[in-house]
Amino acid sequence: CKRVEQKEECVKLAETEETDKSETMETEDVPTSSRLYWADLKTLLSEKLNSIEFADTIKQLSQNTYTPREAGSQKDESLAYYIENQFHEFKFSKVWRDEHYVKIQVKDSAQNSVIIVDKNGRLVYLVENPGGYVAYSKAATVTGKLVHANFGTKKDFEDLYTPVNGSIVIVRAGKITFAEKVANAESLNAIGVLIYMDQTKFPIVNAELSFFGHAHLGTGDPYTPGFPSFNHTQFPPSRSSGLPNIPVQTISRAAAEKLFGNMEGDCPSDWKTDSTCRMVTSESKNVKLTVSNVLKERRILNIFGVIKGYEEPDRYVVVGAQRDALGAGVAAKSSVGTGLLLKLAQVFSDMISKDGFRPSRSIIFASWTAGDFGAVGATEWLEGYLSSLHLKAFTYINLDKVVLGTSNFKVSASPLLYTLMGKIMQDVKHPVDGKSLYRDSNWISKVEKLSFDNAAYPFLAYSGIPAVSFCFCEDADYPYLGTRLDTYEALTQKVPQLNQMVRTAAEVAGQLIIKLTHDVELNLDYERYNSQLLSFVRDLNQYRADIKEMGLSLQWLYSARGDFFRATSRLTTDFGNAEKTDRFVMKKLNDRVMRVEYHFLSPYVSPKESPFRHVFWGSGSHTLPALLENLKLRKQNNGAFNETLFRNQLALATWTIQGAANALSGDVWDIDNEF
């Protein structure tokens, strides 16, 4: 990582190629002495947003000039250069780009196929040569019985009542990511997966519509797991454990219905799906799936622009959006986020140059690519600059898919951001009904965990950077994502008030940026993790008899939780006692806050083998949910319970929590060592 020399200090910013040498933003004559207050900034932001035509930008980004824009394609690059130029026009402190060489999977010239065969493997008929594909599928041909597993969740497989080993599984799109569906099927020794969109959940008129997705249970380039895919790295060939070892293919609804015509058994009524749905292929029929996808190396570009903070430029909030899209449909998937990114960048540039806004901390605007392959661009950047970002990037705000409807405002975030999000929801009005976005004091219980296919996930689970993703959406999935029907026209049809909805999303993101970069005290509520820890300990407590039987005790875990609680209380007291004008003291206190999320990354697993190290939100046996899952097995099925693993899990979880408590306490002489 290059260092950017400032006048006074050296700020490390993650970049690879400088494209602008301007050191500070050009500002008009504005009185710098008068500090703008939250109320002024809120009003200022709102007024600026009122004058912007978001929908026009989204429409422009969805037109032929920039579509289709598969990662690394010519149109993806040309949009990257357009964004780069815009950032220059906004007179950012610095604009740069980040180049990676990544492996993505594309369809081969040989068509993928789904065929019905008889028991002797003789062709009965071709069901479909699908138009879509699933990136990172295994390229293979498999033949077997076809079994419907609803959405392919773990519970769906448990409820199936029929083994799927040696069978191809057909699942509905939705509920969980393609990668999770495939991993669940593969764990039960299924030999292939077909994914379709049923009409009940995805009310699309065109039954022949194909769609796209990826099957990597992870993020980033799966052939450089845990490390960056720069062209000059000397890492030996590697492969993510999240790659499937079975073929996966998306099929149209029409193809699924042809398959159902050769299947038997009514799908359970509680699935609430199409009446045509059937469960298993007739005994005389099998399905043959051929996937011939190939790997291609592509150069991808992430584009960055920074507004440097006036007091703590080496502390930054990152605001990002996905630029690419698989297939021709781009509107809801990447044009809304990219359009919003550009307009927010313009607004903040304006507020600084014309209105006297002086953010204390820096704001990085990032345009990622290869998002459709599993947040590849964002993850590669994180992998490349993990050490540079540590204790510097303190929040990630994801702008992807922020408007997919109007009915609900949904949030997925680190608990550190719950309090701030709650305040902003109380402040911001819904453009349709005029009521505040804060509808329910119990909203936190409805917060969904960030999923693998969200670019915010690697920030939180891999890098330990608090992250937030939000959307205006319906209860039902937006039906056109990943299809060629994800057009501007379709989006405006689904969301007639598109401009107002995006404007409101901009207000939420804008207020977040202001609160996080302007306030002296960092707006990250570290006390929120107390209830997360309490909830975990409560869950674990149900099994105290089992734990006792193994000769183990929860005493040390209680102690670690107690230490964390006391550390948060002490920090709150320290903030209360601190002189807010004492920058040095405030920075030291804020640094302690910034450590919280990072210290929930398990130090006991390798980022290469288990990149998502976060014990609450990560993935792998080191996580607290995995510990509980393992322990649950002791009651259900002693054979599946791994006691040696559990003993390790409990010890390491305890010490990770203790470590987080210690880090929050501050200096080594402040740590209670009676553990």
Partner: antibody, heavy 122, light 109 residues
Amino acid sequence: YVQLVESGGGLVQPGGSLRLSCAASGFSFDKYTMNWVRQAPGKGLEWVSVISNGGVSTDYADSVKGRFTVSRDNSKNTLYLQMNSLRAEDMATYYCARASQPWLYRTGADVWGQGTLVTVSS
Amino acid sequence: EIVLTQSPGTLSLSPGERATLSCRASQSVSSSYLAWYQQKPGQAPRLLIYGASSRATGIPDRFSGSGSGTDFTLTISRLEPEDFAVYYCQQYGSSPPWTFGQGTKVEIK
């Protein structure tokens, strides 16, 4: 313990009606296709009717079509056979039988009830 | 409808002997859709073979099924005393109605 218990048989006059029930236990009833099979005294087996696991599909032997109706109540784990316009040739022991594999409509029957006798006589 | 004809009507054999039962269909039946049952007096039928050759759970390996198209066979390699019963074949491959054969009685010689 997987079990099927038929009930509802008895003496009925020609032209009369009868409703047979089959109570299932020990397995996930809603995942299995169910059949009715009958056997006249001293005669062979005759397939009567089939109903898919969710009750969506039903089929009948030509000899009972239009007179018999098969149904199921998955919440009660019970299979039914409504028999109308009964004839002397319908006199038999009626067995309910479970498909040998979950979900499949066309498969052998691996679990049978003990049967209930239907006597059609004036 | 498909008519299944079983032969012989009665088979008289001694314990330890091999029994070969035939089931002939009036038109072709997919081998996936043929089953064999055993029924003893006063009892419900018991599934022996499904899919023409797959043994049902708990069925001893002396029972085996074979055949395709219109000709199917049930073989009992060594008759045990408990094997003396009536055996039925059933097809469920065509569109319903599904049909049983008239049965073959295996009796002690």
